[in-house]
């Protein structure tokens, strides 16, 4: 030290702005000044540290100056920092320099960083656009430090935006989102890598949501405890200040508790709970939760009502009688209720608790929800409201009518794949059993056939657009005997049975019964196809043919039920039935009700025997139907007389019969001869069936002679003859 003229300010023994020393050495630092002074040390150096000592003495010319010596034994790396000597306040004039400082680096190759955050990074708060310091200060000014952002970004000092200061760390002039993350300062000393980590944490003012529960309006009875919870959701880096405005704020009526919930890793939830015990009428009004975060400001209001005593008022929301429709997904029976506190709610259906009656009933608030409405849901519904503590009870009844769209029972029972056929001329009873609420009106209609005269088909009955409403005296289509309607209880419900009686089935078409009420309309179509063919399909054989004769088969089908009519021959080969088509079939002929297809096979032989089938396709089902007939062509057989003629006598004026029964295939033709002359039928001579008998009445003597019968067919001829003797000839007559 020089003891020259007056000092400009405190003077340190170590000159310059910084000084480097090795760890383990002792730091000696003297301060001389014109006034009393004190030492300011790095935060890492404790004033109570046994290694630290400060000795004060008078010094300088005439001991008029103040000196103090700071001694730090066995200096450590973390003792690195700013050491300053400062005049005590009011101890010197304002013109003087008040403080002198020096930055001491305590260099330690094993501790390049003053603070090591290797296990858990140190949190550093940052604000975008402001200066950010990553405080990885070093123990020696010549240590090279790099700054990395995890995982692999390097933040390189450019002397402007990012600068390195061995005393302060990395200084980022105006921080951006790019600096948010895990930042690591790295230094390699003597081949060893040292790292200290910092987690930059951006402070934001993002208020995501503000809510008050319970939701507004909030109702209380006098004397109850009012509790309101204001919940604020912010992003992870936001902190908020919460306050309440409320009617009793001036008298501090409420106690307010605050807490923070950080269980969500990506947001913060702040709670402010306002509580007033024994709420009074003066506490009613607007309660406002005010939330502030930096420049962000949000408020949320709720309205509080305080009632002296409980109350219930109940009215019909709609009319007392409500209507709904069966099949509806749900129906809500709802009453207009004003009540406090919330009453107990019970709904009755016809005097029985509704929810016990059916699982389809559920109570929501003051409403009864009926799911999947059915006719059984009709009835009287009563809402019972009760507040037991206030001994308050109210009830109100509403009537529910369940309307049902008309249903025709016969439509629901499985219908036949193809319509029935009605025999020509028959009396028919057509019935529709109808249910609906309100009771449906039933009408019968007649739809005449509309023929589609296309090449493909000219005999099918299409439903026509035109229709005629029928009554008991209608003669359109078919003569109507009558239309009747009667009520019947079927399966526990009132149903209307409507009957249409057709007196004489002649005209094909379709009848329909139409049932309608205010809910809707339903129609059942009854195709009325008249047939002149038993069962709508008939096969006949004219006669059993004999070899050489013609085979004649006939197939008649209902034209309303069948199409594609054809004859086929069935043959069995190796236990398999083969269908053989028959060529040279005639064209089918169409009549009023049927289609006829005749099959004629001329000059049949035994080989033509077999199973003949008429095949037709059902118009409705597409199914092929076969009707079979066995044809056995008979073999030719030569005639055979079953009994020969025998001579016999007959009295004159008597009568006689000659019998010539013959068998053969084909049936033989019988011819009679008398004395070789062919007998023709004439008065007195009668030929019986098939000429097999010869009857002579009032025999005369001319009738005597040789009678011969001849049986003939393609296979041969057979004859028999006999002599007829007439007794009492001219002798008798002469006697007369």
């Amino acid at each position: 030290y020089c003891s020259g003229s007056k000092l400009k300010g405190p003077e340190l023994s170590l000159k310059g702005t910084q000084h480097v020393m090795q760890a383990g050495q002792t730091l000696f630092l003297k301060c001389r000044g014109e006034a009393a002074h004190s030492w300011s040390l790095p935060t890492t150096v404790s004033q109570e540290d046994k290694k630290l000592s400060v000795t004060r003495s008078a010094c300088g010319r005439n001991n008029r100056q103040f000196c103090s010596t700071l001694t730090l034994n066995m200096a450590q790396a973390n003792h690195t920092g700013l050491y300053s000597c400062r005049y005590l306040p009011k101890s010197t004039s304002k013109e003087k320099k008040m403080e002198s400082a020096i930055y001491i680096f305590v260099s330690d190759a094993g501790s390049p960083f003053i603070e090591m955050h290797s296990d858990i990074p140190k949190l550093v708060h940052m604000t975008e656009g402001r200066e950010l310091i990553i405080p990885c200060r070093v123990t020696s000014p010549n240590i090279t430090v790099t700054l990395k952002k995890f995982p692999f970004d390097a933040l390189t000092p450019d002397g402007q935006r990012i600068a390195w200061d061995s005393r302060r760390g990395f200084i980022i002039a105006n921080a951006t989102y790019k600096e948010i993350g895990l930042l690591t300062c790295e230094a390699t000393v003597n081949g060893h890598l040292y790292q200290t980590s910092y987690l930059t944490h951006r402070q934001t003012n993002t208020i995501l949501d503000v809510q008050i529960s319970p939701p507004s309006p909030v109702r209380f009875l006098r004397g109850q405890t009012l509790v309101l919870n204001c919940t604020v959701t912010t992003d992870l880096n936001t902190r908020v200040q919460m306050s309440w405005n409320y009617p009793g704020k001036a008298t501090k009526r409420a106690s307010i508790r605050q807490r923070i919930d950080q269980s969500n890793p990506h947001s913060n939830v702040f709670h402010s709970v306002l509580k007033i015990n024994n709420v009074e009428s003066r506490d009613k009004g607007l309660y406002t939760c005010r939330v502030k975060s930096g420049s962000s400001f949000r408020t949320f209001n709720t309205s509080v009502h305080v009632y002296e005593k409980g109350f219930i008022s109940v009215k019909h929301r709609k009319q007392q009688v409500q209507e709904t429709i069966a099949g509806k997904r749900s129906h809500r029976l709802s009453m207009k209720v004003k009540a406090f506190p919330s009453p107990e709610v019970v709904w009755l259906k016809d005097g029985v608790p509704a929810t016990e009656k059916s699982a389809r009933y559920s109570v929501h608030g003051y409403s009864l929800i009926i799911k999947d409405v059915t006719a059984e849901d009709a009835g009287d519904y009563t809402i019972l409201l009760g507040i037991k503590q206030s001994k308050l009870f109210r009830n109100l009844t509403a009537t529910l009518i369940v309307n049902v769209k008309p249903q025709i029972y016969e439509k629901s029972v499985s219908s036949l794949p193809s319509p029935p056929l009605y025999p020509l001329g028959s009396r028919q009873v057509l019935t529709c059993t109808v249910y609906g609420i309100p009771q449906p009106t039933i009408k019968w209609l007649w739809h005449p056939c509309h023929y589609n005269h296309s090449k493909e088909r000219n005999d099918f009955c299409f439903g026509s657009e035109e229709s005629f409403i029928l009554d008991s005296s209608s003669n359109i289509g078919n003569r109507i005997e009558g239309i009747t309607q009667r009520m019947m209880v079927i399966e526990g419900t009132n149903k209307t049975v409507s009957t249409l009686v057709v007196a004489d089935s002649r005209t094909p078409g379709s009848y329909s019964c139409k049932a309608f009420n205010k809910i809707g309309t339903v129609e059942r179509d009854i195709r009325f196809y008249v047939t002149d063919v038993p069962n709508g399909f008939h096969v006949s054989l004219e006669k059993i043919p004999t070899e050489g004769e013609d085979l004649k088969l006939s197939c008649v089908v209902s034209k309303f039920l069948y199409r594609d009519i054809t004859w086929i021959l069935l043959r069995t080969v190796n236990n398999r039935t083969m269908h053989h088509s028959i060529s040279k079939q005639k064209m089918a002929t169409t009549q009023d009700y049927s289609i006829t297809l005749n099959l004629v096979i001329k000059n049949v032989s035994l080989e033509d025997s077999g199973t003949y089938a008429c095949r037709a396709r059902n118009i409705y089902t597409g199914e092929e139907i076969l009707r079979k007939t066995e044809v056995l062509v008979r073999d030719l057989e030569a005639p055979l007389l079953l009994q020969n003629l025998s001579d016999h006598e007959v009295s004159i004026s008597g009568s006689t019969t000659l019998d010539c029964q013959a068998r053969g295939v084909p049936a033989p033709q019988i011819t009679w001869f008398k004395n070789n002359h062919k007998i023709q039928q004439e008065p007195g001579i009668i030929l019986g069936p098939g000429n097999s008998t010869l009857f002579i009445e009032r025999v005369t003597e001319e009738d005597e002679g040789v009678y011969r019968c001849r049986a003939t067919n393609q296979k041969g001829v057979v004859e028999s003859s006999a002599y007829l003797t007439v007794q009492g000839t001219s002798d008798k007559s002469n006697l007369e």
Partner: antibody, heavy 119, light 111 residues
Framework: EVQLLESGGGLVQPGGSLRLSCEAS????????MNWVRQAPGKGLEWVAT????????SHAPAVKGRFTISRDNSKNTAYVQMNSLRAEDSAVYYC????????????WGRGTTVTVSS | QSVLTQPPSASGTPGQRVTISCSGS????????VYWYQQLPGTAPKLLIY???QRPSGVPDRFSGSKSGTSASLAISGLQSEDEADYYC???????????FGGGTKLTVLG
């Protein structure tokens, strides 16, 4: 709610290509690095690729280097991995993960999308 | 072959303490933070431990992590049946310039 949703997986023939997408919601996507990690059936987790917050630096696992490319579009809050020259051994569930929040580990994961490479 | 080494399986009865080890090298565990992940059957992994020993909010304090040199370990005390899962350790690897994982340890809760 913080969410990652992967898409683009499917069946592809060896030598074919696929592009997987990972859409982020509920956090500041542009601030954090994104990763793709895969898991073959019955096997452990295998890191595939990482991209920094700005999309300027990428790193790929040796097994996929030269065939796979990680990228991101911060305007769409979406990360991608383009997979070319696919092999049978690339068949796996591919997860997208991000290093959000304060942990800087993979603290948000998607549900995964399945990639099957088979002829 | 995983860069980090974990035992393939571990087991314990309810209430017991179980430790899972994870061993690496200077380029990964020694110079970087260790993370532990839990993967329940059929789900995506979930972060269990970060910065060697820190628990994210929502993770029970039965789970704890530690690191020493090139090794790390996960301890689960008061084992519960819902802890049955696969556990993976993970860290950044400076030489690979990427994440590395252990092969996973299947934890079975007996009884």
């Amino acid at each position: 709610e913080v969410q990652l949703l992967e898409s683009g997986g499917g069946l592809v023939q060896p030598g074919g290509s696929l592009r997987l997408s990972c859409e982020a919601s509920g956090f500041d996507f542009s601030t954090y690095a994104m990763n793709w990690v895969r898991q073959a059936p019955g096997k452990g987790l295998e890191w595939v690729a990482t991209i920094n917050s700005e999309g300027t630096i990428t790193s790929h696992a040796p097994a996929v280097k030269g065939r796979f490319t990680i990228s991101r579009d911060n305007s769409k809050n979406t990360a991608y991995v383009q997979m070319n020259s696919l092999r049978a051994e690339d068949s796996a569930v591919y997860y997208c993960s991000s290093t959000t929040g304060t942990t800087h580990g993979m603290d948000v994961w998607g549900r995964g999308t399945t990639v099957t490479v088979s002829s | 072959q995983s860069v980090l080494t974990q035992p393939p399986s571990a087991s314990g009865t309810p209430g017991q303490r179980v430790t899972i080890s994870c061993s690496g090298s200077s380029s990964n565990i020694q110079n970087n933070y260790v993370y532990w992940y839990q993967q329940l059957p059929g789900t995506a992994p979930k972060l269990l431990i970060y910065f060697n020993s820190q628990r994210p909010s929502g993770v029970p304090d039965r789970f704890s992590g530690s690191k020493s040199g090139t090794s790390a370990s996960l301890a689960i005390s008061g084992l519960q049946s819902e802890d049955e899962a696969d556990y993976y350790c993970g860290t950044w690897d400076d030489s690979l310039n990427g994440w590395v994982f252990g092969g996973g340890t299947k934890l079975t809760v007996l009884g």
